[in-house]
Amino acid sequence: KSPVFGPQEVSSVEGNSVSIKCYYPPTSVNRHTRKYWCRKGASGRCITLVSSEGYVSSNYAGRANLTNFPENGTFVVNIAQLSRDDSGHYKCGLGINSRGLSFDVSLEVSQGPELPNGTEVYTVDVGRTVTIKCPFKTENAPKTKALYKKIGQTSVLVIDSRNYVNPNYKDRIRLRIPGTGQLIFTVVIDRLRLSDHGLYLCQAGDGSNRDEKNADLQVLEPEPELVYEDLRGSVTFHCALGLEVANVAKFLCRVNSRETCDVVINTLGKRDSAFEGRILLNPQDKDGSFSVVITGLRKEDEGRYLCGAHSDGQLQEGWPIQAWQLFVNEESTIPRSPTVVKGVAGGSVAVLCPYNPKESQSLKYWCLWEGAQNGRCPLLVESQGLVQEQYEGRLSLLQEPGNGTFTVILNQLTTQDAGFYWCLTNGDTRWRTTVEIKIIEGEPNLKVPGNVTAVLGETLNIPCHFPCKFSSYEKYWCKWSNTGCQTLPSQDEGPSEAFVNCDENSRLVSLTLNPVTRADEGWYWCGVKQGHFYGETAAVYVAVEEKKVAGSRYVSPAKADAAPDEKVLDSGVREIENKAIQDPRLFAEEKVVADTGDQAGGSRASVDSSSSEEQGGSSK
């Protein structure tokens, strides 16, 4: 007895598609071995049609695929555009066709129901609109036009040209008779219901001379599109419901075990708290289509999702819907990274953002999720250097550590920085991830002056005190610009006295600017790192003024002034619509913070190599 299991019998009709799921014991060997779908021939041989190694037979080209779900111990064979030639005996299996583990599947494709001659078939999804065309002869042009529904042996009048409308079709049906010369009338039915399914009869005139035309209306539940995404990744539901509902409220809901549909998000401002910080409803286009992006996918996000339109912003029968079945793959290619990062007021955070390692050249972005209305995510920083003006001097995006991860550093934290942030690129959209920054009680670990005024031509020495817990870390100073933070030479001046209860491992590392030039004005960061992984940072603003007093200045934390006021976002800066998330290049118009000059910052620290700490900084 084979441990592979699946449907023994599959039946469908021509033109349709099937999705055949086969189950196998998810042992390590089974999970990674070849999966196949083959057809049994008269000789007993089983000819491969599609396999997990990418093979697709010419007969299946463009209409079939096989997807393996190793964490579930399943694989799915999708076959579209079925014809009666596809009827036959198949096997789904693992390993080699002739001696692997397999399961027999019988597929029967039928022609569909027999219909009266000349019947026109209309296949429409529930909630959509159908237009039934009814031709007639010239002599019946002035006579009554009508549409009947055949129920068993009887015909029930649905609508006629004398203004009769069957109550079941009230407010959603109309009969149109064109001008003279056009020998066709049409019946338009909106917001189709499953109960509208059936055989209809168009009639013009009466008696033996009347014109008749049969129409078979097939109202389908929208076939759920199977969507397979990785744990921690992102999914986008594209919803196109038609122009008829372009101005109606839109929603995405998830079917629950009671078969009702819980709203996940809608355009009326409702949002499920389980999706806080990780969902956006992108504004609709002129045709009424819209999309919903969900990041930070969890196993519990699996299920059936419906998007739709209704003035109440929730599912109602007879209104158009689209359906998806979301599966979340636990054997994710997206690496684990913290979903919550904690920092203290005045301190900093370093956020690791994953991206598809095959897309190392892609542009990297970081945006702040805002929950108002449908949600939006204005970009704060990008790898090409744009930084929102109010983040000047305290935000940087670094390409390190590379190979599928970049780093975002935010310092000078305030309680207003708490919230959800998204990591994204202009490449693979499935790699969008969410991180929540929380501001907790505590003191920053690095101690630096608040702000510093340097004198042109003189020497400036800026101290940074590192507690002993950072003894094994690399310490560095860098000069911030909107394209990164350029490392500068710095000097280890021995143990720091800023930390009591601490041994010789606490350090005072200083940055010396000698002589100070105009180009030295700007933001400087001191920080710690381990290899290419960044830790805490602290920022100091250096202002440069004309020489007034002779001699060098040494700034100690005791003499530090308060940090300069943050610059306020210029009112002229365009609001970033969340549709830009789909194409981050739309953010190019964002105001760019002016580059603060020479990245080396004119630093000329006369430091011998033994006391200098070289640091890679931003690899841009």
């Epitope: 599959v10 399943t74 499953l194 076939e223 075990s257 299920g303 059936r304």
Partner: nanobody, 126 residues
Framework: EVQLVESGGGLVQAGDSLRLSCAAS????????MGWFRQAPGKEREFVTT??????????YYADSVKGRFTISRDNAKNTAYLQMNSLKPDDTAVYYC?????????????????WGQGTQVTVSS
């Protein structure tokens, strides 16, 4: 909610046939699959057969022990599933339960089903 009512159980001789029905009522619109499980005295509930559908496509799953003898079918218009049992054996004696699901990851697993009927007794004497 979806309500399921089984009927058609009874006492038969080995080799005979029996047809069980399971009528669904309530919010059946998003029901995706209906199946049959059975439970013999002192044993765990076991999978017998399930039918799932998507539009005009049907998928039928059977346990090895009933393959070739039992057939599952459904009448969409009546929201009813049927289990035709031929060549019955004494081992088939059990209470047969109808189950329905909105989303099925694995049709063999009872916990995947959202709704259950009260069960109908099938006894096969030798």
């Amino acid at each position: 909610e979806v309500q399921l009512v089984e009927s058609g159980g009874g006492l038969v001789q080995a080799g005979d046939s029996l047809r069980l029905s399971c009528a669904a009522s309530g919010r059946t619109r998003t029901t995706y699959g209906m199946g049959w499980f059975r439970q013999a005295p002192g044993k765990e509930r076991e999978f017998v057969t399930t039918i799932t559908w998507s539009g005009p496509t049907n998928y039928k799953y059977y346990a090895d022990s009933v393959k070739g003898r039992f057939t599952i079918s459904r009448d969409n218009a009546k929201n009813t599933a049927y289990l035709q049992m031929n060549s019955l054996k004494p081992d088939d004696t059990a209470v047969y339960y109808c189950a329905a699901s909105t989303v099925l990851t694995d049709p063999r697993v009872p916990t995947e089903y959202d709704y259950w009927g009260q069960g109908t007794q099938v006894t096969v004497s030798s």
